[in-house]
């Protein structure tokens, strides 16, 4: 709709097109027009602020009748709203509706909200929260609307006494005079920024901050920038010479997606190292997942992520990023004994060799080392060269022989991607040469000895044949593209669920194979296209639905914000800024495009999996039908808590993780297993969090365990875009044996924590497996 | 044509109550507001409270709350407001008016004469 | 409590324009104030003109017109005729509540 995420809207009533506005603080309906009484705008904590009577939308529950009401913003009724799908609801879940023309709040209410001239829910744009600079305030973000001389700000204002747009970062500013700069997105580096040609970028150094990690990063984000990344020696210097620069600050790199090493959270590569080797990237039990940045030595250093901190932010000079066609398929070929693939030839070389002679026997092959550039790439590697259970490690390209550390591709081609293991890339200090292998299993990268006697894989140019309408073995009708073994055809026709076919996406990589087909849909009307996954009995647990009615487990789970918010529903992928994104869907009256997919080869089977009947490890516990393996950390038995990093940690240290789980029966005997085991009120942490940035907030489990349930009740916390890691309640309460999964208003047992609160925990193993000592 | 009809004028007694009321004809009752004025003799107008007819919720005047209560009945589609502890200084002309969703008092009533006497 | 103001007494003559205004004592007038504006007849004949800042109501001549102006809210009578003498009230919105101001009685001759 062109309108930016914090402008005002209209609020349609989608079953009669009227609008809602406020008449002398009741709720009616009138005939829609972007007159200024009928705008409203999200503000800070999930409230609705109406422009023209300058009050928030609420519900008075303390009356008999729930009185739906304009209240003060700074009033304690209950303020905020939140969407589930196109319904409104605020307190005890009661949904806006509309009835006889007033705006009133029950709770079985099924009325659809939009944001006038548009299809978009009221939430499809979130109010972004603006973090500031100067000011008083250490960078908190500002609270909309604020209030000065009676009037209450619902935007950053410009006067002549501050140097920029400016906001309170309290409700009451006359009360407490918090304030800060506005940090906003704005075109070129003017204001807030430093600009440096060399480097192609502009910078902005917030020193008076103190911002966690994740609240550092969605400051830049929302300004269309990141954190800082560091990608060569020069542009170190240039930080540590910088005058007035915070001593110690954030800086974009982190390891917060389960089982992945660090990362830039802008995505660059991470090929250029200077860690310090006092807080090192492979942390003990202790260690922490996020990275700070010394600006005198220039080190780089592994902290805790919710440490208060300044940081930097960067964005690039121009935006034009050069998209290079990887997923396209070309016919290739190659002489007999290597595999080809899009224009390459690949040969898995199963003699162990260091990584220097592994070299030389590329080299006398016409060929190198394989450089990796792309996720395409990877996929070749873990699904062609291997099979995917092959946990041996094998050579590539990629070697540093500096100090400090620059990894650099054998065959001289431009590191673009790096795709680093858990706490890899983990240099030893001043110790060269460096070199990587990837393990078969995930194609993920390890830093070795290049002593090291290992397998390694050549890579050279194959013979690209001519283009044929359709892509080899697809069906020879137009619009057929190929993906591995695999063909898919985008049908644009939009129509309800399982229409045209049941699509089912199993990795990460058929997932940005998908994306990458979706994207010409980025700039048009926000398109969807179904997806075969389906919530079938209602209960709140997502299967593909297959050929004949299959039902077959989630492998991969690709969830948007949220998501999945509801039971019963079938779920379709977003276009647009979340390409790819999963959204539970009404599966009769929603509408969307259609990619078919055709195997040349059957069906793969079902993994193999743990059995039930497997023991436990000594000291571990389990219950009938389980597949895994519990110990239970808590205060009877351990010195502290710990916050869920530390705990994550400490479970991985025995070969474990957190717990996790797939199914809505899993949980519920879980649960009751636990409560038998200790007396009193327990929070436990367990796998479940939305630490990446790569997430965009939704839920992962930390051990890979896709995720298929509805998991995280939508009740309301007002920090909830914060609170990144889940704990279960459990408590002893021998008088009740019914438990509901998702739906349960009178005990939500399962609930979002800030990551540094310091909890009891619970390790688990896949039955049959040794765990460490 | 929308009206609204007010009660006739009442004579009571110091500390006694009256209720007068306000019938609306001629529109959906429901869908609009019902605000109640006074003017006291020479003097400007005061507001008492609103009340929505639709849910029967109310805002008052802080100086009017436990002077004043107003209610709705929707089958008669009438409002009413009771005065309570009548002193000489509640003597005074009331009006009831209504408005729709743009706000403007469209519609009033003809005022209802109060006299607090001994 | 907030207090409202208007000119106690204006003179215009037929055919000019006339502009009454309302101020608050707690600051500036703003749309967040639904500035309401009711004319008084002889006989205590009582007629909406102006609701929220500048909605006029149904029937009521365009010569009559809201606005605010400055930090007050204004009532134009653009054309004045004779029959627009009244006394004329402007009513403002606080925190659910009316305050209405003292009038402004408007002299055509």
């Known amino acids: 709709s062109g309108r930016a995420a914090n402008d005002p809207f209209t609020i349609v009533h989608g079953n009669t097109g009227k609008c809602i506005k406020p008449v002398y603080g009741w709720i009616v309906a009138d005939d829609c027009d972007e007159t200024e009484d009928k705008l409203w705008k999200w503000v800070s904590q999930h409230r609705l602020f109406h422009l023209h009577s300058q009050k928030c939308l609420g519900l008075d529950i303390t009356k008999s009748v729930n009185e739906l009401r304009m209240f003060s913003c700074d009033s304690s009724a209950m303020l905020w709203w939140k969407c589930e799908h196109h319904s409104l609801y605020g307190a005890a879940r009661y949904r806006l509706a509309l009835k006889d023309g007033h705006g009133t709040a029950i709770s079985n209410a099924s009325d659809v909200w939009k944001k006038g001239g548009s299809e978009e829910s009221l939430c499809d744009q979130p109010y972004h929260e603006i973090y500031t600079r100067d000011g008083n305030s250490y960078g908190r973000p500002c609270e909309f609307p604020f209030l000065i001389d009676g009037t209450w700000h619902h935007d950053c204002i410009l006067d002549e006494d501050h140097s920029g747009p400016w906001c309170a970062t309290t409700l009451n500013y006359e009360y407490d005079r918090k304030w800060g700069i506005c940090l906003k997105p704005e075109n070129g580096c003017e204001d807030n920024w430093e600009k440096n040609e060399q480097f192609g970028s502009c910078y902005q150094f917030n020193t008076q901050t103190a911002l966690s990690w994740k609240e550092a990063y969605v400051s830049c984000q929302n300004q269309g920038a990141d954190l800082l990344s560091i990608n060569s020696a020069a542009e170190l210097t240039y930080l540590k010479e910088k005058e007035g620069i915070a001593k110690i600050f954030w800086i974009g790199l982190n390891q917060l997606y389960s089982a992945r090493g660090w990362e830039w959270s802008d995505h660059k590569p991470l090929n250029f190292l200077n860690w310090d080797p006092d807080r090192p990237s492979a942390p003990t039990i202790g260690g922490s997942s996020c990275a700070r940045m010394d600006a005198e030595s220039g080190l780089w250093q592994s902290f805790s992520c919710e440490a208060q901190l300044p940081y930097v932010c960067r964005k690039p000079l121009n935006n034009t990023v050069e998209l290079t066609d990887v997923w396209t398929y070309s016919d290739t070929r190659c002489d007999a004994g290597w595999l080809p693939n899009n224009g390459f030839c690949y040969l898995l070389v199963n003699e162990s060799n260091s990584w220097d002679k592994a070299h030389a026997k590329c080299k006398a092959f016409s060929s190198d080392l394989i450089s990796i550039h792309s996720l395409a790439d990877v996929e070749v590697v873990v699904t062609k060269l291997h099979n995917e259970d092959i946990k041996e490690e094998v050579w590539i390209g990629l070697k540093n022989i500096n100090i400090p550390t620059l990894f650099q591709w054998s065959d001289g081609t431009e590191v673009t991607l790096t795709y680093w293991d858990e706490n890899e890339p983990n240099v030893p200090y001043n110790k060269t040469p460096n070199c990587v292998s990837y393990l078969g299993e995930l194609g993920q990268w390890k830093v070795q000895s290049c002593e090291e006697k290992l397998k390694y894989v050549c890579k050279r140019k194959g013979e690209k044949l001519n283009d044929a309408s359709s892509d080899k073995m697809c069906p020879p009708d137009e619009g057929w593209k190929r993906h591995g073994e695999t063909c898919y055809k985008i049908y644009e026709d939009e129509v309800p669920f399982g229409t045209n076919c049941n699509l089912t996406i199993t990795s990460r990589f058929e997932q940005e194979y998908l994306n990458d087909l979706m994207k010409k849909y980025d700039k048009s009307l926000r398109k969807y296209f179904w997806t075969g996954l389906r919530d079938v009995d209602s209960c709140g647990e997502y299967n593909w639905a297959t050929v004949g009615g299959r039902r077959r487990a989630v492998t991969f789970s690709n969830w948007n914000f949220l998501e999945p918010a509801s039971p019963g529903g079938c779920v379709a992928m977003s276009t647009g800024k979340s390409v790819g994104k999963w959204e539970v869907k009404d599966c009769r009256s929603f509408k969307a495009l259609s990619i078919c997919k055709k195997m040349s080869g059957p069906l793969g089977p079902e993994e193999a999996s743990p059995k039930p009947d497997d023991p436990c490890p000594e000291g571990w516990q389990s219950f009938p039908a389980s597949l895994s393996c519990y110990k239970v950390f808590h205060a009877e038995r351990i010195v502290r808590k710990r916050n869920w990093e530390e705990a994550e940690r400490f479970c991985q240290a025995l070969g474990a993780h957190l717990s996790s789980f797939s199914h809505v029966d899993e949980i519920k005997e879980f649960l009751h297993f636990l409560t038998d085991q200790f007396s009193g009120q327990h929070w436990l942490w367990i796998g479940l969090n939305k630490r990446s940035p790569d997430l965009q907030g939704s839920w992962q489990w930390s051990d890979r365990t896709p995720v298929s349930t509805i998991i995280m009740p939508n009740e309301f916390q007002q920090d909830y875009d914060i609170r990144d890691c889940a704990a279960v309640k459990v408590f002893h309460r021998p008088w009740r044996r019914g438990w509901h999964f998702y739906d349960d208003r009178e005990f939500i047992y399962l609930r979002p924590f800030a990551c540094d609160t310091k909890l009891e925990w619970v390790c688990q193993i896949p039955k049959g497996r040794t765990p460490k000592t | 044509e929308v009206q609204l009809q007010q009660s006739g004028p009442v004579l009571v007694k110091p500390g006694a109550s009256v209720k007068m009321s306000c019938k609306a004809s001629?529109?959906?009752?429901?869908?609009?507001?019902m605000h109640w004025m006074k003017q006291s003799h020479g003097k400007s107008l005061e507001w008492i409270g609103i009340?929505?007819?639709?849910?029967?919720?109310?805002s008052y005047n802080q100086k009017f709350k436990g002077k004043a209560t107003l209610t709705v009945d929707k089958s008669s589609s009438t409002a009413y407001m009771e005065l309570n502890s009548l002193t000489s200084e509640d003597s005074a002309v009331y009006y009831c008016a209504r408005n729709g969703v743009r706000y403007y008092f469209d519609y009033w009533g003809q005022g209802t004469t109060l006299t607090v006497s001994s | 409590q907030a207090v409202v103001t208007q000119e106690s007494a204006l003179t215009t003559s037929p055919g000019e324009t006339v502009t009454l205004t309302c101020r608050s004592s707690t600051g500036a007038v703003t749309i967040s104030n639904y500035a309401n504006w009711v004319q008084e007849k002889p006989d205590h004949l009582f007629t909406g003109l102006i609701g929220g800042t500048n909605n006029r109501a149904p029937g009521v001549p365009a010569r009559f017109s809201g606005s605010l102006i400055g930090d007050k809210a204004a009532l134009t009578i653009t054309g004045a005729q004779t029959e627009d003498e009244a006394i004329y009230f402007c009513a403002l919105w606080y925190n659910n509540q009316f305050i209405f101001g003292s009038g402004t009685k408007v002299t055509v001759l």
């Open positions: 001629g529109n959906t009752f429901t869908d609009s507001f």
């Open positions: 009340i929505n007819p639709y849910n029967g919720g109310t």
